[in-house]
Interface confidence: medium
């Protein structure tokens, strides 16, 4: 039986998007490239639900993980890799005392229960994001059954 899998193998589905949590580490710029190579983008967070989901993935694996957010263009002005600004309501995700820009920390990572700014040249895990497949009859993602990745409960 052919089943619909909206995401590629080893990607996780959540609210209409697919996420890839890397198992290797790269610096922030190379993480952007890695995501582009698989037709995705270093993760840009659009909602509180998405943030909670991703934060939980990161904290469960106890990994420092790059997201697509930096203030490289202008110090103190945080911007996503798709060009959108950091929404006011997202400021609450920074860990206590962050962002602190100690030693030119211009790229954002998932760290513990929130976000931290760190040096962009450091190697960390990363998360890619792309839209889920629609699963029409001719969609490539009709694959042999893959293990379903359940959505975790809200944080």
């Amino acid at each position: 039986e052919r089943l619909c899998h909206p995401c590629p193998w080893e990607w996780t589905f959540f609210q209409g998007n697919c996420y890839f949590m890397s198992n290797s580490q790269r610096n922030w710029h190379d993480s952007i490239t890695a995501c582009k190579e698989v037709g995705a983008q270093l993760v840009v967070i659009k909602s509180a639900e998405e943030q909670n989901f991703l934060q939980l993935q990161s904290s469960r694996s106890n990994r420092f993980t790059w997201m697509g957010l930096s203030d490289l263009n202008q110090e103190g002005t945080w911007q996503w890799v798709d060009g959108s600004p950091l929404l006011p309501s997202f400021k609450q995700y920074w860990n206590r005392g962050e962002p602190n820009n100690v030693g030119e920390e211009d790229c954002a990572e998932f760290s513990g229960n929130g976000w931290n700014d760190d040096k962009c040249n450091l190697a960390k895990f990363w998360i890619c994001k792309k839209s889920a497949a629609s699963c029409s009859r001719d969609e490539e993602q009709f694959l042999s059954p893959a293990p379903a990745t359940p959505n975790p409960p809200p944080a």
Epitope: S47, A48, E49, Q51, N52, G76, P88, S89, K91, Q92, Y93, W94, N95, R96, G97, E98, P99, N100, G112, N113, G114, W115, P154, A155
Partner: antibody, heavy 122, light 106 residues
Framework: QVTLRESGPALVKPTQTLTLTCTFS??????????VSWIRQPPGKALEWLAL???????YYSTSLKTRLTISKDTSKNQVVLTMTNMDPVDTATYYC??????????????WGRGTLVTVSS | DIQMTQSPSTLSASVGDRVTITCRAS??????LAWYQQKPGKAPKLLIY???SLESGVPSRFSGSGSGTEFTLTISSLQPDDFATYYC????????FGQGTKVEIK
């Protein structure tokens, strides 16, 4: 010990501008993640958020009142000032200032001042 | 703007009762919700943040639950000091309070 104290006139005439000062101690508004808000409560009614100022000087205003409100801070004096123009009797309320703590649990209000009652009347 | 609706507006209860207050958001706010207690002539006091986290120093008989658009504040065994007005507040997008629930003596 963290404290916040509101001060300002108890009585304001209609059309006048209200200026309220929140003086705080025990924390700094230059610490990342810390914010101070103004919230009001008309007698016998619910709480209404008015404005918030962040450690980095970002400012946010209630959609319905933003044309009348201005919030500012003096970090060296540990003060946040709210001005509200064109006062009307319906603006009679207790005005509170409150702190938002730093941290990744969100921008709720963990500490409040005692409030100051402002009456608008001619 | 996100609207917050509390129910009931008034609740009559006795000491020892289990009390539940509901708060609904007009759109999903994930778990960015706080609960406050206010007594007459006093400033509000934070009880719960992030929907279910108990503020330091708040008695454990208070608990919060919910996610998305529906939330509850529960007082497991009402004490004399608990008769007050309770407000929910969302902080997912700017800041909005519910209209309050007054818990009075039956």
């Amino acid at each position: 010990q963290v404290t916040l104290r509101e001060s300002g006139p108890a009585l304001v005439k209609p059309t006048q501008t209200l200026t309220l000062t929140c003086t705080f101690s025990g924390f700094s508004l230059s610490t990342s993640g810390v914010s101070v808000s103004w919230i009001r409560q008309p007698p016998g009614k619910a709480l209404e958020w008015l404005a918030l100022i962040d450690w980095d000087d970002d400012k946010y205003y209630s959609t319905s009142l933003k044309t009348r409100l201005t919030i500012s801070k003096d970090t060296s004096k540990n003060q946040v000032v709210l001005t509200m123009t064109n006062m009307d009797p319906v603006d009679t309320a207790t005005y509170y200032c409150a702190r938002t703590p730093s941290g990744s649990y969100g921008r709720y209000f963990d500490l409040w001042g005692r409030g100051t009652l402002v009456t608008v009347s001619s | 703007d996100i609207q917050m609706t509390q129910s009931p507006s008034t609740l009559s209860a006795s000491v020892g009762d289990r009390v539940t207050i509901t708060c609904r958001a007009s759109q999903s706010i994930s778990n960015w919700l706080a609960w406050y207690q206010q007594k007459p002539g006093k400033a509000p006091k934070l009880l719960i943040y992030k929907a279910s986290s108990l503020e330091s120093g708040v008695p454990s008989r208070f608990s919060g639950s919910g996610s998305g658009t529906e939330f509850t504040l529960t007082i497991s065994s009402l004490q004399p000091d608990d008769f007050a007005t309770y407000y929910c507040q969302q902080y997912n997008s700017y800041w909005t309070f519910g209209q309050g629930t007054k818990v009075e003596i039956k």
